[in-house]
């Protein structure tokens, strides 16, 4: 299953499959997730070790048993790959690291006014993988405001150094934010020239293209089909690059197929997995396990559930079958691709779906061992769970926010439905940033069911929580995916990095905002909050957030939207925007419904009709 917990001051001993430099544990975890054999990782922050060569070291590990012995190491951080973690699987990494220089091949230098502009330049450059920016206070005047675009053979820095007034980060191409655009065309009977960066075996050009997309240095590819004249080169997928970023030449060649990486696509990237099943094909590799199952789909599910399994072959040979069940060969290799592909067999083969980010049709939870006033504009994909609840009352308008918590579930505030309980007047927009982008043709979700908490009463602040079941499930993308819920009665976690988002008013007597706003607000203890609201009862099922001096808060139109907090690199839905005295007033914090206190209710209501829990537990 999916394991998300991080282990502080712990280092996994042995099992090394690769090592690299990464700026933090979260990036190390992402590299582990996308490495074909990595199940566990250990990361050494700069503060944890004196050995300069091992600072920022990220160690990717494998284990036949799925675990390794942990040794105590002050400052080290260890954890699990996010394979099998559904929507949490993403190669997108937005963080900017202050006081850190990520080294690599510097291939472009320009003057820019901000680190965000530098990151944008990197994202819009086909070869840029990461960057460093020297701020205006950098010690050498001639380097100030320099934006260095970089790459390396492995896509990660060749070294990371602590350096004042330097900020570094990664390209946002894996976030589907590149302005370059991509070539979707597949070119039949055409071979590209240039430098081969890797060679793998794939059953078709589409798998080859997906592997190219997620390979750090692949810009285009050539695939040799299973009828290519040279037998030893059949099904070979050559991942390629060039200085210019495009093929320098192409040659007409029978039984070859060429194409481009889709990493530069805007708004949609292919999933990092291959779901197609190939009948009459055997995939060769190292044997992991053999099991008898009924049907090729069950074989694929079995492979997906066994975390080390990368691909499988389901044999229909009479000697491999008994009654209705046949042998399912679960296999793996060093690079995640078959070591041999045979055609005209009585088998069917395919890949594990462990890296598919659609996950199951569920709500995401975690286990643990009203515009925003004073906010700023959000960017694409920053809060992919945020939805806009709109009503079509001839004129259409945004009324509330909400949070996507599963393919078919949105969590919001009950008071959003005061006076508007009719489900067919509501339209739910997900994956949007600007309300002005919504036109008559913009797709929206309709409501199948509104589930208001049974103890909620109109005009009272208690139990202000409601679930919306959508008529049709949503697909997950970088711009539309769920937020994880906290564990039941989560009281031990101290959240220090919390944000409220919404399109609500920017002042008490304001108007709905066009661009989704975000504001960083600290949580306030319930005791402190109660002092500020002596006429109301602040219950343990509420959570408050705000600054003593005011100035930053949720406001009208933000209701129902998320209060999210980042903990151990993972965002969780801590609160639902509910009520407050005015907006952003001094010593009047915002009051939010505390989601952890309603986990039993959420779980009960999101049970599917067949009684199967719709919950996904990353831990």
């Amino acid at each position: 299953g999916c394991l998300t917990q991080l282990y502080e001051n712990a280092f996994f001993r042995g099992g090394d499959v690769a090592s690299m430099y990464t700026p933090n544990a979260q990036y190390c975890q992402m590299r582990c997730t996308f490495h074909p054999r990595c199940l566990l990782f250990s990361f050494l922050p700069a503060s944890s070790i004196n050995d300069m060569e091992k600072r920022f070291g990220c160690f990717l590990k494998d284990s036949v048993t799925g675990t390794l012995p942990k040794v105590h190491r002050t400052g080290a951080v260890s954890g699990h790959s996010l394979k099998q973690c559904g929507h949490q699987i993403s190669a997108c990494h937005r963080d900017i690291y202050k006081g850190v220089d990520m080294r690599g091949v510097n291939f472009n230098v320009s003057k820019v006014s901000s680190v965000e502009e530098c990151q944008k330049r990197c994202t819009s450059n086909i070869r840029c993988q990461f960057f460093s920016y020297a701020t205006q206070t950098f010690h050498k005047a001639e380097y100030r405001n320099n934006c260095l675009l970089k790459y390396s053979p492995g896509g990660t820095p060749t070294a990371i150094k602590v350096l004042s007034n330097v900020e570094s980060g990664f390209s946002l191409k894996p976030c589907a934010l590149s302005e370059i655009g991509c070539h979707m065309n597949i070119f039949q009977h055409l071979a590209f020239s240039d430098v081969d960066v890797a060679r793998v075996l794939t059953p078709d050009a589409f798998v080859c293209r997906t592997i190219c997309t997620y390979h750090p240095n692949c810009l285009f590819f050539t695939f040799y089909t299973n009828v290519w004249k040279i037998e030893s080169q059949r099904n070979v997928c050559l991942l390629k690059t060039s200085e210019s970023g495009t093929p320098s030449s192409s040659t007409p060649q029978e039984n070859t197929i060429s194409g481009y990486s889709l990493l530069t696509c805007k708004r949609t990237l292919p999933e990092p997995c291959h779901s197609k099943i190939y009948p009459g094909v055997d995939f060769g590799g190292e044997e992991l396990n053999v099991t008898f199952v009924k049907g090729v789909n069950v074989c694929q599910e079995t492979c997906t559930k066994m975390i080390r399994c990368q691909f499988f072959t389901y044999s229909l040979l009479p000697e491999d079958c008994k009654e209705e069940k046949c042998k399912c060969f679960l296999r793996l290799s060093m690079d995640g691709s078959p070591t041999r592909i045979a055609y005209g067999t009585q088998g069917s083969s395919g890949y594990s779906l462990r890296l598919c980010n659609t996950g199951d049709n569920s709500v995401c939870t975690t286990k643990t061992s009203t515009r925003i006033v004073g906010g700023t504009n959000s960017s694409w994909g920053e809060w992919p769970w945020q939805v806009s609840l709109q009503v079509k009352l001839t004129a259409q308008r945004h009324l509330c926010g909400g949070s996507l918590i599963g393919h078919q579930w949105v969590l919001t505030a009950a008071h959003c439905f005061d006076g508007l309980p009719l489900q067919d007047v509501w339209r739910i927009y997900s994956g949007i940033l600007n309300l002005s982008d919504i036109t008559k043709d913009t797709p929206f979700s309709q409501i199948k069911e509104i589930i208001i908490h049974q103890n909620y009463k109109v005009s009272e602040g208690n139990h202000d929580i409601a679930l919306i079941k959508l008529q049709a499930p949503l697909n997950y993308t970088e711009f539309q995916k769920p937020i994880c819920l906290p564990s039941k009665g989560d009281t031990s976690t101290i959240y220090t990095n919390c944000w409220v988002t919404g399109w609500g008013f920017s002042k008490e007597k304001g108007e709905i905002q066009n661009i989704l706003q975000k504001v960083n607000i600290p949580l306030v203890t319930n005791e402190e909050c109660q002092k500020r609201y002596q006429d109301y009862k602040i219950t343990q099922r509420m959570v408050c957030a705000g600054y003593k001096e005011g100035g930053k808060d949720a406001c009208k139109g933000d209701s129902g939207g998320p209060l999210v907090c980042k903990h151990n690199g993972m965002w969780r839905l801590v609160g639902i925007t509910s009520w407050g005295e005015g907006c952003a007033r001094r010593e009047q914090p915002g009051v939010y419904t505390k989601v952890a206190e309603y986990m039993d209710w959420i779980l009960e209501k999101t049970q599917s009709s067949d009684g199967k829990a719709q919950m996904q537990s990353p831990a």
């Epitope: 001839t394 004129a395 009324l399 005061d418 006076g419 508007l420 309980p421 009719l422 067919d424 007047v425």
Partner: antibody
Framework: QITLKESGPGILQPSQTLSLTCSFS??????????VSWIRQSSGKGLEWLAH???????RYNPSLKSRLTISKDTSRDQVFLKITSVDTADTATYYC?????????????WGQGTLVTVSA | DIKMTQSPSSMSASPGERVTITCKAS??????LSWFQQKSGKFPKTLIY???RLVDGVASRFSGSGSGQDYSLTISSLDYEDMGIYYC?????????FGAGTKLELK
């Protein structure tokens, strides 16, 4: 039970300002989704929608008359008002205030009985 | 503005007869259409909303259908009291616009 009742001056002269009041009961204009429209009916132009006001004070007007129309409300007194400036004989009509079906704006569920306004020199 | 073309402008029918009135919008109105009846000297009475939903208390002989640009009101078995003028109105977008009306008379 939901009722709406229009009141107006009956007769007025060209270039004057027409002031209409809609007094209603059985619902509140502070309820989310609620709204009230003004519609008029004349023998020459048939039925014509004039303006709509929502619970949150959002206002919509017929573009062909927008410069002359002002819709407003007094939520505490359960009243909606319409002002039409610079009237002429073409504004002679029966004026209705209407409320949507149920909670949502779904056609006109409830009509007032109408008030006849005659513009005459 | 969305133009609503209603037909016929007038018609005669006998009690018990099936009567259909149509309304065509100049663009797709997503079923945001209402039908109402007005008897001589009286204020209008809504029959149908959202193209096919019957208002509570309205006789079941009235029904609405249609989608996109084309809509119709059907009276399955005409009654004496059904005489009057029938109008359609679109409320997909402002300004709301009406059909010119269909005058239904007894044969």
């Amino acid at each position: 039970q939901i009722t709406l009742k229009e009141s107006g001056p009956g007769i007025l002269q060209p270039s004057q300002t027409l002031s209409l009041t809609c007094s209603f009961s059985g619902f509140s204009l502070s309820t989310s989704g609620m709204g009230v429209s003004w519609i008029r009916q004349s023998s020459g132009k048939g039925l014509e929608w004039l303006a709509h006001i929502y619970w949150d004070d959002d206002k919509r007007y017929n573009p062909s008359l927008k410069s002359r129309l002002t819709i407003s409300k007094d939520t505490s007194r359960d009243q909606v008002f319409l002002k039409i400036t610079s009237v002429d004989t073409a504004d002679t009509a029966t004026y209705y205030c209407v409320r949507p079906h149920y909670y949502a704006f779904d056609g006109f569920g409830y009509w007032g009985q109408g008030t006849l306004v005659t513009v005459s020199a | 503005d969305i133009k609503m073309t209603q037909s016929p402008s007038s018609m005669s029918a006998s009690p018990g007869e099936r009567v259909t009135i149509t309304c065509k919008a100049s663009q797709d109105i997503n079923s945001y259409l209402s039908w109402f009846q007005q008897k001589s000297g009286k204020f209008p009475k809504t029959l149908i909303y959202r193209a096919n939903r019957l208002v509570d208390g309205v006789a079941s002989r009235f029904s609405g259908s249609g989608s996109g640009q084309d809509y119709s009101l059907t009276i399955s078995s005409l009654d004496y009291e059904d005489m009057g003028i029938y109008y359609c109105v679109q409320y997909d977008e402002f300004p709301l616009t009406f059909g010119a009306g269909t005058k239904l008379e007894l044969k």
